[in-house]
Interface confidence: low
């Protein structure tokens, strides 16, 4: 009778560095000591008639056991293979370009340490949840690669390295590790320089808007511009409108940077650069500056009007023109009445680069005089009639501006000067208008003829 | 010395989201690992998930899976757990804390950030 | 889920008398790898939990020793020798054998 060794469990898997029940039994009556030949370390547990039990312990790769044992002086054997998975230790994908030219071929490197049995692991490179590359682990470490052509739906996308252990036929399921994702940065710069738009002329010490432009840029947002005069930073305001970028800032010139000057952009993606460059003249251009001798004069006193600018700028005033550029224009007036408020108008022209710029300016002279009171205004007398309206019409001129008051002779009885008055019979009788300032009085008699009231 | 300083207290509407960071110092931040776990007012401790911030592999408990996430910013050492569809027994102190290896004890906690989900 | 029973939940000491608390796993807490992952957490008035003993018997550095903890497979224990003042708090055992990670619900030492 032919006798079996049975070993349990038979070709069990198991997780690496796992520990395992080994069963070694017979059904021959008169079996000796089972024996267990193994390499792992194995320790017995328990035997009787026909059975003995083991632990295999840190079970670290594939093994075979072998149960042997003699029946009736005959040696009969058993075995069982072991299978040992283990996931992977590291599952790594490669640092990606900082930035990536769309339209060009990029790399995609995953490394795997670890991971067995080898011919059940495969590792998939993937871009968001789309697989790019499946292919099996071999060496060790398991190196994968794929070739990836980046297009702009590229920018952003997170990717990643996926290992699969399918441990699905020996009824364990299938163990997936991922990497840490990368992120990839894809552009596009155009090999087209900027647009710039600044000024040709910039006086010291004032403002002007220079713009640089840019279209067919992509990630427009992530664009780095640097806008300059000569050596000085200018600070932009960055614009973004789909694929097209604006700098805006403010061009200041200092006096230090007088002549001929460069304004300079520079647009900067994926570490490639565009430039553009205009050429622009700083000037100087003081004034004009109009001066009174006496800004505040006296009637009959002399004043004497000058206008004045920088070097190369020629000044004309109130249409007298300057002997030469950069010298002053003058001129000299008996200060009377007339003249109070009387406006000196000065241009001045500056030429820059054969352009000719102008400004102007002017200056209002004050003379002081005293009060008076013009008759041709006031009427002396004035044939009213009782209980009607009516406004006197009296004006008053001087340097300062004079007060006029009219009180009736002999009383303290004041009219409204300008201002229309319910006359009565009351009024009748002569008034003095007096017109008073710091200056002096002038005082002019009115009388008023009040026509009593008919009842018929 | 290692310290887990985490963001300030939250005070959310039902369905909303919250964010709450936790930025690690004085140990390399990729070496270890990041645990979150909450504490309803009066209640005991509730684990919710972990992070590997070197490979940025995570684990969540069942309890809240959909609704957690967690991330990793290594490039400033901060951790982040958000999570949405917030619910009135969500209110409770939330603790971000590290482990060294799997699977070892939560050695280092954050100071905690309370999160309140009232309408 | 691994279910961490504590007991008792409520524990008034007397300030150096011994103090002991047991905790015990609904499922064996060895690891594959053969270690015990129980551990041990205080959470002090006011304060964040803070580790005292790691991995059953492990006392994290800093930590008094006269806190210890014993224990195998599924039946755990912690162990004040003399209770001090300072001890006052919840304590938590919690696994980290099997995922998710769980907590015992807390024990309250206070004061008599």
């Known amino acids: 009778q032919e006798f079996l060794l049975r070993v349990e469990p038979q070709n069990p898997v198991l997780s690496a560095g796992g520990s395992l029940f080994v069963n070694c039994s017979t059904d021959c009556p008169s079996s000796e000591k089972i024996a267990l030949e193994t390499s792992l370390s194995k320790e017995l547990v328990a035997s009787g008639m026909g059975w003995a039990a083991f632990n295999l312990s840190n079970v670290t790769g594939n093994s075979r056991i072998l149960c042997s044992v003699y029946c009736n002086g005959s040696q009969i054997t058993g075995s069982s293979n072991i299978t040992v998975y283990g996931l992977p230790e590291r599952v790594e994908l490669a640092p990606l370009p900082p930035w990536q030219p769309v339209g060009q071929n990029f790399t995609l490197r995953c490394q795997v340490e670890g991971g067995s049995p080898r011919t059940s692991l495969t590792v998939v490179l993937l871009r968001w949840e789309e697989e790019l590359s499946r292919q099996p682990a071999v060496e060790e470490p398991a190196e994968v690669t794929a070739t990836v052509l980046a297009s702009r739906d590229d920018h952003g996308a997170p990717f990643s390295c996926r290992t699969e252990l399918d441990m699905q036929p020996q009824g364990l399921g299938l163990f997936v590790n991922t990497s840490a994702p990368r992120q990839l940065r894809t552009f596009v710069l155009p090999v087209t320089p900027p647009r710039l738009v600044a000024p040709r002329f910039l006086e010291v010490e004032t403002s002007w808007p220079v713009d640089c432009t840019l279209d067919g840029l992509f990630p427009a947002s992530e664009a780095q511009v640097y806008l300059a005069l000569g050596d000085q930073m200018l600070n932009a305001t960055v614009m973004n409108h789909g694929d097209t970028l604006t700098a805006t800032a403010t061009a200041t010139a200092r006096a230090d940077q007088e002549g001929a000057r460069e304004i300079v952009c520079n647009v900067t993606l994926g570490g490639e650069r565009r430039e553009a460059r205009e050429n622009l003249t700083v000037f100087s251009f003081l004034g004009p500056i109009v001066n009174l001798s006496e800004p505040t004069a006296h009637e009959g006193s002399t004043v004497t009007v000058s206008c004045m600018a920088g070097a190369r700028v020629q000044v004309t005033l109130d249409g007298v023109p300057a002997a030469a550029p950069g010298q002053t224009a003058q001129l000299q007036l008996n200060a009377t009445e007339s003249d109070d408020g009387r406006s000196f108008f000065c241009s001045a022209t500056l030429e820059v680069d054969g352009e000719f710029l102008h400004r102007n300016s002017s200056v209002q002279l004050r003379v002081l005089y005293g009060p008076k009171i013009d008759r041709a205004t006031c009427p002396q007398h004035l044939k009213w009639k009782d209980k009607t309206r009516h406004v006197l019409q009296c004006q008053a001129r001087g340097n300062p501006y004079p007060e006029l008051r009219c009180l009736k002779e002999g009383s303290s009885r004041e009219v409204p000067v300008g201002i229309p008055f319910f006359v009565n019979v009351t009024h009748n009788g002569t008034y003095q208008c007096q017109a008073s300032s710091s200056r002096g009085k002038y005082t002019l008699v009115v009388v008023m003829d009040i026509e009593a009231f008919s009842s018929h | 010395q290692v310290q887990l300083v985490q963001s300030g207290a939250e005070v959310k509407k039902p369905g909303a989201s919250v964010k709450v960071s936790c930025k690690a110092s004085?140990?390399?931040?990729?070496?270890?690992?990041i645990l979150w776990v909450r504490q309803a007012p009066g209640q005991g401790l509730e684990w919710m998930g972990k992070?590997?911030?070197?490979?940025?592999?995570?684990t969540y408990a069942q309890k809240f899976q959909g609704r957690v996430t967690i991330t990793a910013d290594t490039s400033t050492s901060t951790a982040y757990m958000e999570l949405s569809s917030l619910r009135s027994e969500d209110t409770a102190v939330y603790y971000c804390?590290?482990?060294?290896?799997?699977?070892?004890?939560?050695?280092?906690w954050g100071q905690g950030t309370l999160v309140t989900v009232s309408s | 889920d691994i279910v961490m029973t504590q007991s008792p939940l409520s524990l008034p000491v007397t300030p150096g008398e011994p103090a002991s608390i047991s905790c015990r796993s609904s499922?064996?807490?060895?690891?594959?790898?053969?270690?015990?992952?129980l551990h041990w957490y205080l959470q002090k008035p006011g304060q964040s939990p803070q580790l005292l003993i790691y991995?059953?018997?492990n006392r994290f550095s800093g930590v008094p020793d006269r806190f210890s903890g014993s224990g195998s497979g599924t039946d755990f224990t912690l162990k004040i020798s003399r209770v001090e003042a300072e001890d006052v708090g919840v304590y938590y055992c919690?696994?980290?054998?099997?995922?998710?990670?769980?907590f015992g619900q807390g024990t309250k030492v206070e004061i008599k």
């Open positions: 804390a590290r482990k060294e290896a799997y699977p070892d004890a939560m050695d280092y």
């Open positions: 004085g140990y390399t931040f990729t070496d270890c690992i």
């Open positions: 992070i590997n911030p070197y490979f940025g592999t995570t």
């Open positions: 499922q064996s807490l060895v690891h594959s790898n053969g270690d015990t992952y």
């Open positions: 991995k059953v018997s």
């Open positions: 919690s696994q980290s054998t099997h995922v998710p990670y769980t």
